[in-house]
């Protein structure tokens, strides 16, 4: 008799999830020589332990603590780049600007990037059919709680000037409901962070508006200022040129506004 299985609204666990996490861990420790003390099998066991046999709407940050401990890693606190709804460009940027780091440049962020996972209460099975959707089902699901946990820790570690890349093509350039807006902004430490600098990335080639004047950016400025952190904002009118100039800062065309 086929066992009844809860149908969730979101996509199921990414296929070959255990193999992917393990392979990513091995690759990460190969690329980063000072993370070679990390035992990838232990990392996978801790990851698995956070959600296997647990109800996928009842996951807590506490469930991820063993994984957090194993993956403890500190990036230079003054070189942190946050992003919201513009992940690809943020990652392209840190691949060129090698001394800046997004969450996905750390071990735990790298392991989970673009993956989905969940289990089932009281069984050791991984659910490859469906997983809870944050909006339609529940917010305390394995994926959301993971990103909330690592994002909070990442923001708490930041110091000096913190940069955030925001998508100027979206109706809400700053979205209070995004991970950046709901978690990271509120976990920057005013005693360590002097300034949050927003980079608003323009989408259209002919778009010359000052998106730093957008009401949602003003809302971000207000939230940040109330937390005793300075705020600054820059328009990045030409993201392609912006990346090119990061690669080749000596290029004569890089003196003009990008």
């Amino acid at each position: 008799v086929p066992r009844w299985r809860q149908q969730w609204s979101g996509p199921g666990t990414t296929k070959r999830f255990p193999e992917t996490v393990l392979a990513r861990c091995v690759k990460y420790t190969e690329i980063h020589p000072e993370m070679r003390h990390v035992d990838c099998q232990s990392v996978w066991d801790a990851f698995k332990g956070a959600f296997i046999s647990k109800h996928p709407c009842n996951i807590t940050e506490e469930d991820y603590q063993p994984l957090m401990k194993l993956g403890t890693q500190t990036v230079p606190c003054n070189k942190i780049l946050l992003w919201s709804r513009i992940k690809d460009l943020a990652h392209q940027f840190t691949q060129v600007q090698r001394d800046m780091f997004t969450l996905e440049d750390t071990l735990l962020g790298y392991l989970a990037d673009d993956l989905t996972w969940c289990g089932e209460f009281n069984t050791s099975k991984i659910n490859y059919q469906s997983c809870p959707d944050w909006r339609k089902d529940c917010s305390n699901n394995p994926v959301s709680v993971f990103w909330k946990t690592v994002s909070r820790r990442f923001a708490e570690a930041a110091c000096d000037v913190v940069h955030v890349m925001l998508n100027g093509s979206r109706s809400k350039i700053f979205d209070k409901n995004s991970t950046f807006g709901s978690v990271e902004v509120h976990n920057l430490q005013p005693e360590k962070v002097q300034t949050l600098e927003a980079w608003v990335i323009h989408g259209g080639r002919e778009d010359s508006r000052d998106l730093c004047q957008d009401p949602t950016i003003k809302e971000l400025e207000s939230i940040i200022s109330k937390r005793n952190i300075q705020f600054s904002c820059k328009n990045i009118y030409r993201p392609d040129k912006f990346l090119q100039c990061v690669k080749n800062p000596e290029d004569s065309s890089c003196t003009s506004e990008i």
């Epitope: 690759k27 190969e30 690329i31 980063h32 020589p33 000072e34 070679r36 003390h37 990390v38 401990k69 194993l70 403890t72 890693q73 500190t74 990036v75 230079p76 606190c77 090698r98 001394d99 780091f101 440049d105 750390t106």
Partner: antibody, heavy 120, light 111 residues
Framework: QVQLVQSGAEVVKPGASVKVSCKAS????????MHWVKEAPGQGLEWIGY????????NYNQKFQGRATLTADTSASTAYMELSSLRSEDTAVYFC?????????????WGQGTLVTVSS | DIVLTQSPATLSLSPGERATISCRAS??????????MHWYQQKPGQPPRLLIY???SRATGIPARFSGSGSGTDFTLTISPLEPEDFAVYYC?????????FGGGTKLEIK
Amino acid sequence: QVQLVQSGAEVVKPGASVKVSCKASGYTFTSYAMHWVKEAPGQGLEWIGYIYPGQGGTNYNQKFQGRATLTADTSASTAYMELSSLRSEDTAVYFCARTGGLRRAYFTYWGQGTLVTVSS
Amino acid sequence: DIVLTQSPATLSLSPGERATISCRASQSVSSYGQGFMHWYQQKPGQPPRLLIYGASSRATGIPARFSGSGSGTDFTLTISPLEPEDFAVYYCQQNKEDPWTFGGGTKLEIK
């Protein structure tokens, strides 16, 4: 600025142990791994291993595994290397060294070195 | 372990000349588009000093006369023109695999 200050020279007997310290300043001690490197007379440089003070993780060169013990006191921002069962070939200058961290795993900062002489 | 073989062991040159030091690895030390090879200079009684990282990038404060090249198993450190303060011992070092290993060193001496 980043500074790594090591303990003074030691003369020890064969079979004994020695513990060399490396006091770090000018940066967040728990954020970077601390490495140890051996320079024996006329022998060049040899990597012993590292400790990641933030999590206590260690990684040893198999050649030194079992005889070298790397520890850290985060409250004192000090790393230690203890070498046991000393023999004459352990006579060397021992350096602590720090890298630039994530994506910059090469030795940017060095201690001044500690000469350990094993002699009866 | 990855063995790094430096040549020559000793190099005798005059200031103003070009020094070329080779470092050959027993297996590739390049991976994922990165070169896990670094170069250091050491003078008597001092710790080593980082010159080149990632095979070809100059460390902060290192003059342009120092350059690094190579990939896979063959790497080169070039110093041109030589200045009097450049006479020292030079080491290559890899961290592609554990244990991290150093070359045997090249002594650059004044002719």
